[in-house]
Amino acid sequence: APTSSSTKKTQLQLEHLLLDLQMILNGINNYKNPKLTRMLTFKFYMPKKATELKHLQCLEEELKPLEEVLNLAQSKNFHLRPRDLISNINVIVLELKGSETTFMCEYADETATIVEFLNRWITFCQSIISTLT
């Protein structure tokens, strides 16, 4: 059974992940971002189901495509360069989903834009955090 300290750690990690994803979304939606139209042409895979921490496997697999899209954006929109930002997110995701997970990601048939993708995972983080508090 999860202890209060492990629950608190999970909550903090999810909050960190949430902030990173929100920062990316804000950077992309910045009205000064001239690359937004181009960025919206990239397609992302969405999870069929995202209700548990193990489902973060689906986010992990899309981090490299996310980095490639962020490389198009103006670097001043983000505090970190895309490679470092994604690496930080990857570390959190690996810890949250657990290295021993046997879950294989299943994706929805429809792909999504980067904005829809980020919003989906932001909602996921918010949902899990609300169950922990």
Epitope: Q57, E62, K64, R83, N90, T101, M104, Y107
Partner: antibody
Framework: EVQLLESGGGLVQPGGSLRLSCAAS????????MSWVRQAPGKGLEWVST????????YYADSVKGRFTISRDNSKNTLYLQMNSLRAEDTAVYYC????????????WGQGTLVTVSS | DIQMTQSPSSLSASVGDRVTITCRAS??????LNWYQQKPGKAPKLLIY???SLQSGVPSRFSGSGSGTDFTLTISSLQPEDFATYYC?????????FGQGTKVEIK
């Protein structure tokens, strides 16, 4: 024990095709990105291709793009490399390797399988 | 593409020597640098990842340092089993690229 075992190498004529396989054991195959790395005789290492854990994302070196196809069958714990329109410069030992995450370090390697393209 | 240049391409050393191999990237790759050891007829083996992290099971005589464009692999006291070829590899961006290798031979 974590293990990768390649097979399918051999002699093929220029323009021919070959399919390499890599059988994985000792770890949860579907949660790891997997790659192929090659080494021409007496030369250094060259990254060829990477595939995500579920198989939906694939990445290729420019030198093989359009000719090689990476795929995986997670139910069989097997990674594949379909090589078409082979050229003499594709002659190499092909290694399959596990990545800690996509574009992470290659932490587990197979023993390699030799592909020779010659007429 | 990011070019990785190793030096020297080969070196001769004795058991017990301190050996240093350098790797230079053509652009800033932060600490996304890995080192591998390869013996003749064998697959490469991961020694160091993220520039300075020692891979599990690798002897502590191996160490890595550096960030940005300049990196170093050090073997503090060369052992008989360390005679091999060493490769650096960047995992900063695609295509993933390796150095040309440094062959460590017995003096």
């Amino acid at each position: 024990e974590v293990q990768l075992l390649e097979s399918g190498g051999g002699l093929v004529q220029p323009g021919g095709s070959l399919r390499l396989s890599c059988a994985a054991s000792g770890f949860t195959f579907s949660t790891y990105a997997m790659s192929w790395v090659r080494q021409a005789p007496g030369k250094g290492l060259e990254w060829v291709s990477t595939i995500s854990g579920s198989g939906v994302r694939t990445y290729y070196a420019d030198s093989v793009k359009g000719r090689f196809t990476i795929s995986r069958d997670n139910s069989k714990n097997t990674l594949y490399l379909q090589m078409n329109s082979l050229r003499a410069e594709d002659t190499a030992v092909y290694y399959c390797a596990r990545e800690t995450y996509i574009y992470g370090p290659f932490d587990v390697w197979g023993q390699g399988t030799l592909v020779t393209v010659s007429s | 593409d990011i070019q990785m240049t190793q030096s020297p391409s080969s070196l001769s050393a004795s058991v017990g020597d301190r050996v240093t191999i350098t790797c230079r990237a053509s652009q800033d790759i932060s600490t996304y640098l890995n080192w591998y050891q390869q013996k003749p007829g064998k697959a490469p083996k991961l020694l160091i990842y993220d520039a300075s992290s020692l891979q599990s099971g690798v002897p502590s005589r191996f160490s890595g340092s550096g960030s940005g464009t300049d990196f170093t692999l050090t073997i503090s006291s060369l052992q008989p089993e360390d005679f091999a070829t060493y490769y650096c590899q960047q995992s900063y961006s695609a295509p993933l690229t390796f150095g040309q290798g440094t062959k460590v031979e017995i003096k």
